[in-house]
């Protein structure tokens, strides 16, 4: 019989034969043959492996560094990782939650709409019109531009969402 | 080595006055939004005041408002919190903290007692 060039759903093609993949938490010891299975093996304490694969080695999971603020949220499993999170108080800097922070700061052309607490983090808006931010700040709301006419000047470089107007005087030469 | 040696705590009475200080160094001081934070016995992490890198805006918790002063000294690479009358309800462990604010700049913290 001809050879096959794709094979189903949880196989995978070697040697010009389809061999069946590891399941979930096992990984591969030896491709199948035309007279054996496909050989796997339990992944060891602290290793996963989460999809049907042919991987010789297993995963790692991931350690929730104690000295980065981090601590098991979930255990992890031969087909699981190990998920992190903060301590009480902390908050993730990202969605895998590798490091924590205190809060996390609001960039420049954006202000803080609500200061962290301990169960949520910073809440930033971005600076309407009128209004700017020149600076990584985790309580400063965005400040109003200067008004140069109440100062009895003129704006000579229009504000933006990071700087603020900067202003001049009049021009008194009138034509 | 980023560093903040928080001092200054101590045991005193209701009414009283403390002024902690937060030593930094391993990084420039002058420019960065500073923070203290405070943790009671057996409570969350709670934010209390901060200021800017310009040392021109400053924050307080309503629970501090009027009675704590927050301030810096750029040339000392030193940040301040002025404590007055003090109450019961601010016993606990006092931190500073910086940008980014992450745990592993995390200092040991100065114990405050108010108790008579």
């Known amino acids: 019989p001809e050879p096959p060039t794709a094979c189903r759903e949880k196989q995978y093609l070697i040697n010009s034969q389809c061999c069946s993949l590891c399941q979930p938490g096992q990984k591969l010891v030896s491709d199948c043959t035309e007279f054996t299975e496909t050989e796997c093996l339990p992944c060891g304490e602290s290793e996963f492996l989460d999809t049907w694969n042919r991987e010789t080695h297993c995963h790692q999971h991931k350690y929730c560094d104690p000295n980065l603020g981090l601590r098991v949220q979930q255990k992890g499993t031969s087909e699981t990782d190990t998920i992190c999170t903060c301590e009480e108080g902390w908050h993730c800097t990202s969605e895998a939650c590798e490091s924590c922070v205190l809060h996390r700061s609001c960039s420049p052309g954006f202000g803080v709409k609500q200061i962290a607490t301990g169960v949520s983090d910073t809440i930033c808006e971005p600076c309407p019109v009128g209004f700017f931010s020149n600076v990584s700040s985790a309580f400063e709301k965005c400040h109003p531009w200067t008004s140069c006419e109440t100062k009895d000047l003129v704006v000579q470089q229009a504000g933006t969402n990071k700087t603020d107007v900067v202003c001049g005087p009049q021009d008194r030469l009138r034509a | 080595e980023v560093q903040l040696l928080e001092s200054g705590g101590g045991l005193v009475q209701p009414g009283g006055s403390l002024r902690l200080s937060c030593a930094a160094s391993?990084?420039?001081?002058?420019?960065?939004e500073m923070w203290w934070v405070r943790q009671a016995p057996g409570k969350g992490l709670e934010r209390v005041s901060?200021?800017?890198?310009?040392?021109?805006?400053?924050y307080y918790a309503d629970s501090v408002k009027g009675r704590f002063t927050i301030s810096r000294d750029d040339s000392k690479n030193t940040l301040y919190l002025q404590m007055n009358s003090l109450r019961a309800e601010d016993t606990a462990v006092y931190y500073c903290?910086?940008?980014?604010?992450?745990?592993?700049?995390w200092g040991h913290g100065t114990l405050v007692t108010v108790s008579s």
């Open positions: 391993g990084f420039t001081f002058a420019g960065y």
């Open positions: 901060a200021i800017s890198g310009s040392g021109g805006s400053t």
């Open positions: 903290a910086k940008e980014p604010y992450s745990y592993d700049y």
